[in-house]
Amino acid sequence: ATKLTEEKYELKEGQTLDVKCDYTLEKFASSQKAWQIIRDGEMPKTLACTERPSKNSHPVQVGRIILEDYHDHGLLRVRMVNLQVEDSGLYQCVIYQPPKEPHMLFDRIRLVVTKGFSGTPGSNENSTQNVYKIPPTTTKALCPLYTSPRTVTQAPPKSTADVSTPDSEINLTNVTDIIRVPVFN
């Protein structure tokens, strides 16, 4: 069975969060997709969304967030550029399907942004994460105002029995330091 999980990304100020959410191609290819933040005890807040209908490989930029929907692959790419400490939080991708509630995608992203300049010359960090070339065609899409009451933050279980961390041989040079935490089975 599919597990809803959290993946933790620990990044520095100025870097870029670069993630993907996959969806069922046949069902949701042209549906409008959104990137949401979930604050403790609150309903998810939509930060950016694709156009309606969603256009293939067409970057949509809302502030520092860039969404790109690869219809023919069932992938939504999300980039948050020039990260700030206050961007730390829990994020998720959803698919809008009115009049039904938004459909939540796997996985949730736990973003932790810390202080510290990451672009020092000669550092082993991936400096690509610091600067992003803004796509030549960007659109600000209008997002539906409703949010889903079902997706209020739920704390992960206390047990760590099912927690898996990255394999020891993986070296991601601090760019995507990821810890996977199942939220529920």
């Epitope: 993630v19 069922t24 490989s57 690869y70 790419r77 996985d107 690509t128 898996s164 760019v175």
Partner: antibody, heavy 123, light 107 residues
Framework: QVQLVQSGAEVKKPGASVKVSCKAS????????INWVRQATGQGLEWMGW????????GSVKKFRDRVTMTRDTSISTAYMELSSLRSEDTAVYYC????????????????WGQGTLVTVSS | DIQMTQSPSSLSASVGDRVTITCQAS??????LNWYQQKPGKAPKLLIY???NLETGVPSRFSGSGSGTDFTFTISSLQPEDIATYYC?????????FGQGTRLEIK
């Protein structure tokens, strides 16, 4: 350690289908996407597509879209790639590959490779 | 689709030589570029990811540099075991594509 063990070589007739398996061990199977890459004899590498073993979702490049099916059986940590309507130009070694980062990362770096499965299409 | 052009397609060098392979993308791919080594009859092996990061366990004689459209892969001192075909691969967007490969042999 991470291991991807693929099924053995296959000889198929044009028009037939082939299903290649890829058994993963040494890591949590549902945490990392599996990709498929093929290589015709003496040729370069060609990316076919990806599958998220957790969600079961997958995607493939246009040229394979109508002919390829990527599935998995999480109970035995195995991914499958089925290619139908085979033609002679599908003769190649097919590799399953695990990415460097977890499923949500946009990090398409092919870190762990299976040993490859030679599929020969001949009448 | 983004085209990746490697040059040269083949090269011959002596043990101890500095060897350089280039890869050019048909458009800006930032640093979304990997390098692989493939020995005859074997699966490819990831050497460099994100243009310049050395994969764990890969000897330090291998290095990568570049960003945007132009990338370079270097072997600082060629060893006999480095005889292989080398491929670049981008992942700036979908679909992912590889260069056509550079065959490296010993003089």
């Amino acid at each position: 350690q991470v291991q991807l063990v693929q099924s053995g070589a296959e000889v198929k007739k044009p028009g037939a289908s082939v299903k290649v398996s890829c058994k993963a061990s040494g890591y949590t199977f549902t945490s990392y996407d599996i990709n498929w890459v093929r290589q015709a004899t003496g040729q370069g590498l060609e990316w076919m597509g990806w599958m998220n073993p957790n969600s079961g979702n997958s995607g493939s490049v246009k040229k394979f879209r109508d002919r390829v099916t990527m599935t998995r059986d999480t109970s035995i940590s195995t991914a499958y790639m089925e290619l139908s309507s085979l033609r002679s130009e599908d003769t190649a070694v097919y590799y399953c590959v695990r990415l460097i980062g977890y499923s949500s990362a946009w990090k398409w770096s092919f870190q762990h490779w299976g040993q490859g499965t030679l599929v020969t299409v001949s009448s | 689709d983004i085209q990746m052009t490697q040059s040269p397609s083949s090269l011959s060098a002596s043990v101890g030589d500095r060897v350089t392979i280039t890869c050019q993308a048909s458009r800006d791919i930032s640093k979304y570029l990997n390098w692989y080594q493939q020995k005859p009859g074997k699966a490819p092996k990831l050497l460099i990811y994100d243009a310049s990061n050395l994969e764990t366990g890969v000897p330090s004689r291998f290095s990568g540099s570049g960003s945007g459209t132009d990338f370079t892969f270097t072997i600082s001192s060629l060893q006999p075991e480095d005889i292989a075909t080398y491929y670049c691969q981008h992942y700036d967007n979908i679909p992912i594509t590889f260069g056509q490969g550079t065959r490296l042999e010993i003089k």
